[in-house]
Interface confidence: low
């Protein structure tokens, strides 16, 4: 439905508050280095302009596309060239090339200071003094650090952020009330950002077909009672929503997401029995709830898959008539029967099925050729099952911190060229799979674990893409989206790697480590562990464990000492010498 003024249409649909919030998110995700005040000024100007268009859709410039309006506004920033360098060249281009250019300059790892949480009283005062500015600042800080954060979902986080301050700033013990809520929002926010980053990578690097296949599999698991036609409609709509958000079209994305939630709730009888509670909630909560809803029960009378996809004489005819529809039906039928499989495994099975039909439907006796196709699935299914079993046993044996360390060693040996901060961040996240998924019964472990690992490995891929240093990482990241995890799992020690020169400075520690939180202290120790492996990639587990145990004892001893700094200096030298001897450096 064409509107005379797109900006007026979105302003009316979304309302002023959401409109302003989404424009702020969009601008902060594009110009990640700009000061908060500059962004607020731009947003206010866009909002005032939108209001003139609501009053008169024929007013000057109201017929321009949102990309044109927003791009023109971003290009008025005076310091564009100094702050962003070649990104300023985007402003010389016309739409749609200009928007594509801005998208390409989004930085997954912007050089921004770490967000330090002020004292609770300071935050509460700021919240009470100017609630609107306080919440805008939250949107701005998250959006600029996470340039692909799912914008409508960020509005939901902001709503929870506001609720936390509203409740806790009047509590008797403000800190006890507020801090756990902020920790939860931070952890959920990081997870939400990473999940969305994978969706955008899927669309941008592997195309719409790849994303749609993912969506068919996931929605079929979630809504196994829904008909294939219903799932296909939801997949089409969901693809549009995510394409828009990943493309920076945040107003359209939020509007279309609201429409999709409305459709799902109006048609829940033919979609899922689990949606009732979600559909009673307000819009932002409703959309979030639907996105997280548990899988519906599988219909009890599902026939065997073999009849339609192996035994039928019409397999090749059906495949030839509409390849993607037939493969979509296969994926739908397989996924709705297998809530116990990861989405990536289901996609591997569908790919194997497709490859088999491509080969067999050209053979002399197609049926004879594809008759055993389901037997080919067995090793594909067992590989992640066995891997998860082994790693959950290791996790239960070691606990999260030591399990992370085992993964740090494993991944540093596989891809030692990757920067130490990236290896630490990615391995720590890989290690969280243990506490996240191993507690589940077997039927839920694989979808939890392997789909989570896909999200974490995508972080490695997007960070590595910014500064590529390893052909092996590039290969695993680009060859196949669904085989990334098996590709990384299959990597052995990189025998071509020339060990890093030993630098005593890397292993020099000071008394400030004693005042760090447990998490920060772990990161320091894990950073040292990665550096050790880079110096001595052939070091055995036992050697590394001995050095790390000595290191932990050294930190504990010096943090208890009266003169901490002297202890770190003197005992540190001894530790470095002993470690060098132990590792033969």
């Amino acid at each position: 439905d064409a509107h005379k003024s797109e900006v007026a249409h979105r302003f009316k649909d979304l309302g002023e508050e959401n409109f302003k919030a989404l424009v702020l998110i969009a601008f902060a995700q594009y110009l990640q280095q700009c000061p908060f005040e500059d962004h607020v000024k731009l947003v206010n100007e866009v909002t005032e302009f939108a209001k003139t268009c609501v009053a008169d859709e024929s007013a000057e410039n109201c017929d321009k596309s949102l990309h044109t309006l927003f791009g023109d506004k971003l290009c008025t920033v005076a310091t564009l060239r100094e702050t962003y360098g070649e990104m300023a060249d985007c402003c010389a281009k016309q739409e749609p090339e200009r928007n594509e250019c801005f998208l390409q300059h989004k930085d997954d790892n912007p050089n921004l200071p770490r967000l330090v949480r002020p004292e609770v009283d300071v935050m509460c005062t700021a919240f009470h003094d100017n609630e609107e500015t306080f919440l805008k600042k939250y949107l701005y800080e998250i959006a600029r650090r996470h340039p692909y954060f799912y914008a409508p979902e960020l509005l939901f986080f902001a709503k929870r952020y506001k609720a936390a301050f509203t409740e806790c700033c009047q509590a008797a013990d403000k800190a006890a009330c507020l801090l756990p809520k902020l920790d939860e929002l931070r952890d959920e926010g990081k997870a939400s950002s990473a999940k969305q980053r994978l969706k955008c990578a899927s669309l941008q690097k592997f195309g719409e077909r790849a994303f749609k296949a993912w969506a068919v599999a996931r929605l079929s698991q979630r809504f196994p009672k829904a008909e294939f036609a219903e799932v296909s409609k939801l997949v089409t709509d969901l693809t549009k929503v995510h394409t828009e958000c990943c493309h920076g079209d945040l107003l359209e994305c939020a509007d279309d997401r609201a429409d999709l939630a409305k459709y799902i709730c109006e048609n829940q009888d033919s979609i899922s029995s689990k949606l009732k509670e979600c559909c009673e909630k307000p819009l932002l909560e409703k959309s979030h709830c639907i996105a997280e809803v548990e899988n519906d029960e599988m219909p009890a009378d599902l026939p065997s898959l073999a009849a339609d996809f192996v035994e039928s004489k019409d397999v090749c005819k059906n495949y030839a008539e509409a390849k993607d529809v037939f493969l979509g039906m296969f994926l739908y039928e397989y996924a709705r029967r297998h809530p116990d499989y990861s989405v990536v495994l289901l996609l591997r099975l569908a790919k194997t099925y497709e490859t088999t039909l491509e080969k067999c439907c050209a053979a002399a006796d197609p049926h004879e050729c594809y008759a055993k196709v389901f037997d080919e699935f067995k090793p594909l299914v067992e590989e992640p099952q066995n891997l998860i079993k082994q790693n959950c046993e290791l996790f239960e044996q070691l606990g999260e911190y030591k399990f992370q360390n085992a993964l740090l060693v494993r991944y540093t040996k596989k891809v030692p060229q990757v920067s130490t901060p990236t290896l630490v961040e990615v391995s720590r996240n890989l290690g969280k799979v243990g506490s996240k998924c191993c507690k589940h019964p077997e039927a839920k472990r694989m979808p939890c674990a392997e789909d989570y690992l896909s999200v974490v490995l995508n972080q490695l891929c997007v960070l590595h893409e910014k500064t590529p240093v390893s052909d092996r990482v590039t290969k695993c990241c680009t060859e196949s989206l669904v085989n990334r995890r098996p590709c990384f799992s299959a990597l052995e020690v990189d025998e071509t790697y020339v060990p890093k020169e030993f630098n005593a400075e890397t292993f020099t520690f000071h008394a400030d480590i004693c005042t760090l939180s447990e998490k920060e202290r772990q990161i320091k120790k894990q950073t040292a562990l990665v550096e050790l492996v880079k110096h001595k990639p052939k070091a055995t587990k036992e050697q590394l464990k001995a050095v790390m145990d000595d290191f932990a004892a050294f930190v504990e001893k010096c943090c208890k000492a009266d003169d901490k700094e002297t202890c770190f200096a003197e005992e540190g030298k001894k530790l470095v010498a002993a470690s060098q001897a132990a590792l033969g450096l």
Partner: nanobody, 123 residues
Framework: QVQLQESGGGLVQPGGSLRLSCAAS????????IGWFRQAPGKEREGVSC????????NYADSVKGRFTISRDNAENTVYLQMNSLKPEDTAVYYC????????????????WGQGTQVTVSS
């Protein structure tokens, strides 16, 4: 090769007992619900009992409730049907079948089938 193999059938007197086994090869039973079915000559195949993949949920046909017990040993990759107080009308070929995670209400809902084992109850 994915296979289910029933064993333990035979000839038994009324009131006697048998223990049927269903062993899986080529795949792990952890992820599958296992159903026992029987088919008497000239009759439709009917459900006897089923156990879900977790082992937590079991169900029985009214005609065997209180007499038959289904159990599973995932370590052995085997499901058992203990049949006590057998009656002549229990005579049939007994089949086991596998379906992902949950028991099904219809015969065609099962993905894998065994060849069957004969149970005859006669004096």
């Amino acid at each position: 090769q994915v296979q289910l193999q029933e064993s333990g059938g035979g000839l038994v007197q009324p009131g006697g007992s048998l223990r049927l086994s269903c062993a899986a090869s080529g795949f792990t039973l952890d992820y599958y619900a296992i159903g026992w079915f029987r088919q008497a000559p000239g009759k439709e195949r009917e459900g006897v009992s089923c156990i879900a993949s977790s082992g937590g949920s079991t169900n029985y046909a009214d005609s065997v409730k209180g007499r038959f017990t289904i159990s599973r040993d995932n370590a052995e990759n085997t499901v058992y049907l203990q049949m006590n107080s057998l009656k002549p009308e229990d005579t049939a070929v007994y089949y086991c079948a596998a379906a992902v995670l949950e028991c099904r209400t219809v015969v065609r809902g099962y993905d894998y089938w065994g060849q069957g084992t004969q149970v005859t109850v006669s004096s």
